[in-house]
């Protein structure tokens, strides 16, 4: 008995469907046993579906009822499943196991990793620190959603809407602005991007003079 998945990693967009491939080969014609799909995470393992060759009965894990379909050719050699309405919770490693009692009680397995793709949500831009000349401030940018994890980059424009170089690396977040001055004034755009989308937010920086203590 041999079991194989034709791909190691599959990528599919949230809300869509994906077929996790699994095929098996055996010389046995009188089949008694199971096809089982499990989802393996570091925190736990959970049953996706079990199919019994004898009873032809499917048993689905809670999160997969009405959302997972087993191939119509499960008896022939195709143990693939299709998962509908993908969510971020479906990210993980899936293991296809085929067990045949009549094949010397052999159990064979194969795995496929599923990456559910989600474009970045519109990032939140914020300023940490007081916008006073001479101070240091931090510009932060974060997308609540995005898979794979979004990459962040910054661009800076002066009051005349001309792009200007940033003194520190433009990728990553937060962006640290040291010893701010009127020269720092302008607006800053953070771009959040991954394989499936791009979003941005901007912040206006307008340093004010230190208050006079009389």
């Amino acid at each position: 008995l041999t079991v194989e998945t034709t791909q190691d990693i599959l990528r599919a967009a949230r809300g869509r469907s994906v077929t996790l491939p699994c095929t098996y080969n055996t010389y046995v014609s009188d089949r008694e046993g199971f096809i089982q799909w499990d989802k393996l995470l570091r925190s736990q393992t959970e049953r996706v579906v079990t199919w019994n060759f004898v009873t032809k009965k499917y048993i689905y894990g809670n999160r997969y009822e009405n959302r997972v379909r087993v191939s119509n050719d499960a008896e022939l050699s195709n143990a693939s499943i299709t998962i509908d309405q993908l969510t971020m919770d479906d990210n993980g490693t899936y293991e296809c196991s085929v067990s045949l009692m009549s094949d010397q009680d052999v159990n064979a397995k194969s795995r496929v990793r599923l990456l559910v793709l989600v474009p970045p949500s519109k990032p939140d831009c914020s300023i940490q620190g007081e916008m006073v000349i001479g101070n240091n401030i931090q510009l932060t940018c974060h997308s609540a959603e995005g898979s794979p994890s979004p990459q962040y980059s910054w661009k800076s424009y002066n009051a005349q809407n001309q792009q200007r170089p940033l003194t520190q690396p433009v990728s990553g977040e937060p962006l640290l602005l040291k010893n701010i001055s009127t020269e720092t004034a302008g607006y800053y755009i953070c771009t959040s991007s991954n394989d499936v989308g791009i979003e941005s937010c901007n912040i206006t920086v307008a340093p004010r003079p230190p208050s006079m203590n009389i």
Epitope: F34, T45, T50, I59, E65, N107, A108
Partner: antibody, heavy 118, light 107 residues
């Protein structure tokens, strides 16, 4: 004939360590997830730990997390449970059990007694 | 973790009686519920898997039913060798959990 033969139990002091072994034969050990289950004196069965067939996914009951480590050597057809920082409440008969698709815990070892006492 | 509650915790019955043991899960576990028989000094024995499938070699007087959160194990006609402790166990997800057990004694 499928068999799971256990060894390594015994008496150990609180805070001590012990390693249990489970030798498999009669089936393709490397294809099956394996588990440890225990039964304390006068108590019911308690699942302790599970390991995937290839040994890369390990799961533990909260009661043993951080103290017990499950491992396997597929070349030697052997399953292990390394127990450390042992407590009196870990006193139990420990069983290894094979987990098959559809039929979890279908074959069990004979059990080995671990006694934690000063 | 999913909790399993068995009832009754102990039961006295006679040879030939029909006996039912129930197991309730704290959340839905579909049909991923298994039943084991355990006798003192022996390893537990799998009787029923995925709620209602009889393990190979287990007498047909044992049967299981249920799905979601409520499950039952029925022994249609008790035999002398059936006096033991019975456990339900969920295999829907880790941590796998067992019920507290039902001790079946001779009346």
């Amino acid at each position: 004939q499928m068999q799971l033969v256990q060894s390594g139990g015994g008496l150990v002091k609180p805070g001590g360590s012990l390693r249990l072994s489970c030798a498999a034969s009669g089936f393709t050990f490397s294809s099956y997830n394996m588990n440890w289950v225990r039964q304390a004196p006068g108590k019911g069965l308690e699942w302790v730990s599970s390991i995937s067939s290839s040994g890369d996914f390990m799961y533990y009951a909260d009661s043993v997390k951080g103290r017990f480590t499950i491992s396997r050597d597929n070349a030697k057809n052997s399953l292990y449970l390394q127990m450390s920082s042992l407590r009196a409440e870990d006193t139990a008969v420990y069983y290894c059990a094979r987990e098959g698709p559809g039929t979890p815990f279908d074959y069990w070892g004979q059990g080995t007694l671990v006694t934690v006492s000063s | 973790a999913i909790q399993l509650t068995q009832s009754p915790s102990s039961l006295s019955a006679s040879v030939g009686d029909r006996v039912t043991i129930t197991c309730r899960a704290s959340q839905s576990i579909s049909s991923f519920l298994n039943w084991y028989q355990h006798k003192p000094g022996k390893a537990p024995k799998l009787l029923i898997y995925v709620a209602s499938s009889l393990q190979s070699g287990v007498p047909s007087r044992f049967s299981g039913s249920g799905s979601g959160t409520d499950f039952t194990l029925t022994i249609s006609s008790l035999q002398p060798e059936d006096f033991a402790t019975y456990y339900c166990q969920q295999s829907h997800n880790t941590p796998y959990t067992f019920g507290q057990g039902t001790k079946l004694e001779i009346k």
